[in-house]
């Protein structure tokens, strides 16, 4: 039974040409972590595995940076960012649990970032 | 105490076909991912897989991908390689080997040969 | 991949000698190198990981430094027992690569 919750940075905002760190943490759950993969809607940004490292995906190489810990810096953000990330969470032996972030890039100065929230 | 036996090594053709087999003990192998490892006569050490616990998911070197599958059973706490399409440049030690960024424990290796 | 490239690739040295290897990253690795000792017809035995860390049963005259793409494996009084080639190895970016190995031999 999987009993594990992942907690988001939820709904986000930054600025264009700026940066932000995707952030999921997954809690309740001894499940070993094997794997975070990190997505963009189909498309797959980067990979954390325990054992080996991170991958990049080369499409991404230039603007996408490891951390922090399991998350993700995304750099020089354009308005063509906006829109839904997916942490994967592969575990042992739960399986796989899947966190939701939706980060709006904004053209003006101001950038707020939204509220923590869960997903079960 | 931790024990990884490699098995399955020697002699083969080019274009041949070789499962090398991993025992391990000392530990629950079904919590852990492994991966193998080899070094050929005289030379360095190179990554060649690696498997997740569930063996779900599986990684492997761009010089062995397509050709070497990595696989495991958990309930005889053994890994495999199956090794298919053997060229001359695979001749080498293989090492199983396991660890969380690091490679915490090896066994002993096994040579594989391929030549004509 | 990243390339890891150790300097040098072999060293004469006396027992008691300080000895030191380097390994340089082609692209920062962090502190996720590790360091590993073999001896012939042996298989890689782990001496140091995550740049500065001992395991358990290794001595204390082993030791790791640096950060980024710059690392250092250090033998403060080299013993017998440890003329044998020495492996750098980065776990920062998959896949895994080594270094192409440092031969410490008796003078």
């Known amino acids: 039974m999987m009993t594990g919750t992942i907690e988001t940075t939820g709904n986000i905002s930054a600025e264009k040409g700026g940066s932000i760190i995707l952030q999921c943490h997954l809690s309740s759950t001894t499940a070993q972590v094997t794997q975070v993969n990190w997505e963009q809607q189909d498309q797959l940004l980067a990979i954390c595995n325990a054992d080996l490292g991170w991958h990049i995906s080369p499409s991404f190489k230039d603007r996408v940076a490891p951390g922090p810990g399991l998350g993700l810096t995304l750099q020089s953000l354009t308005v063509n960012d906006t829109g839904e990330y997916f942490c994967i969470y592969h575990t042992y032996p739960d399986g796989t649990y899947t966190g939701r972030i939706f980060l709006e890039v904004l053209e003006s100065s101001v950038a707020e970032h939204g509220a923590r929230f869960q997903i079960p | 105490e931790v024990q990884l036996l490699e098995s399955g090594g020697g002699l083969v053709q080019p274009g041949g076909s070789l499962r090398l087999s991993c025992a391990a003990s000392?530990?629950?192998?079904?919590?852990?991912?492994v991966s193998w490892v080899r070094q050929a006569p005289g030379k360095g050490l190179e990554w060649v897989s690696w498997?997740?616990?569930?063996?779900?998911?599986?990684y492997y070197a761009d010089s062995v991908k397509g050709r070497f599958t990595i696989s495991r059973d958990n309930s005889k706490n053994t890994l495999y390689l199956q090794m298919n399409s053997l060229k001359a440049e695979d001749t080498a030690v293989y090492y199983c080997?396991?660890?969380?960024?690091?490679?915490?424990?090896w066994g002993q290796g096994t040579l594989v040969t391929v030549s004509s | 991949d990243i390339q890891m490239t150790q300097s040098p690739s072999s060293l004469s040295a006396s027992v008691g000698d300080r000895v030191t290897i380097t390994c340089r990253a082609s692209q920062t690795i962090s502190s996720y190198l590790n360091w590993y000792q073999q001896k012939p017809g042996k298989a890689p035995k782990l001496l140091i990981y995550?740049?500065?860390n001992r395991p358990s049963g290794v001595p204390s005259r082993f030791s790791g430094s640096g950060s980024g793409t710059d690392f250092t494996l250090t033998i403060s009084s080299l013993q017998p027992e440890d003329f044998a080639t020495y492996y750098c190895?980065?776990?920062?970016?998959?896949?895994?690569?080594f270094g192409q190995g440092t031969n410490v031999e008796i003078k």
């Open positions: 995550e740049n500065n």
């Open positions: 000392g530990f629950t192998f079904s919590n852990y991912g």
């Open positions: 080997a396991k660890g969380r960024r690091r490679f915490d424990y």
């Open positions: 498997i997740s616990p569930h063996g779900a998911l599986t």
């Open positions: 190895q980065q776990s920062y970016i998959i896949p895994p690569t």
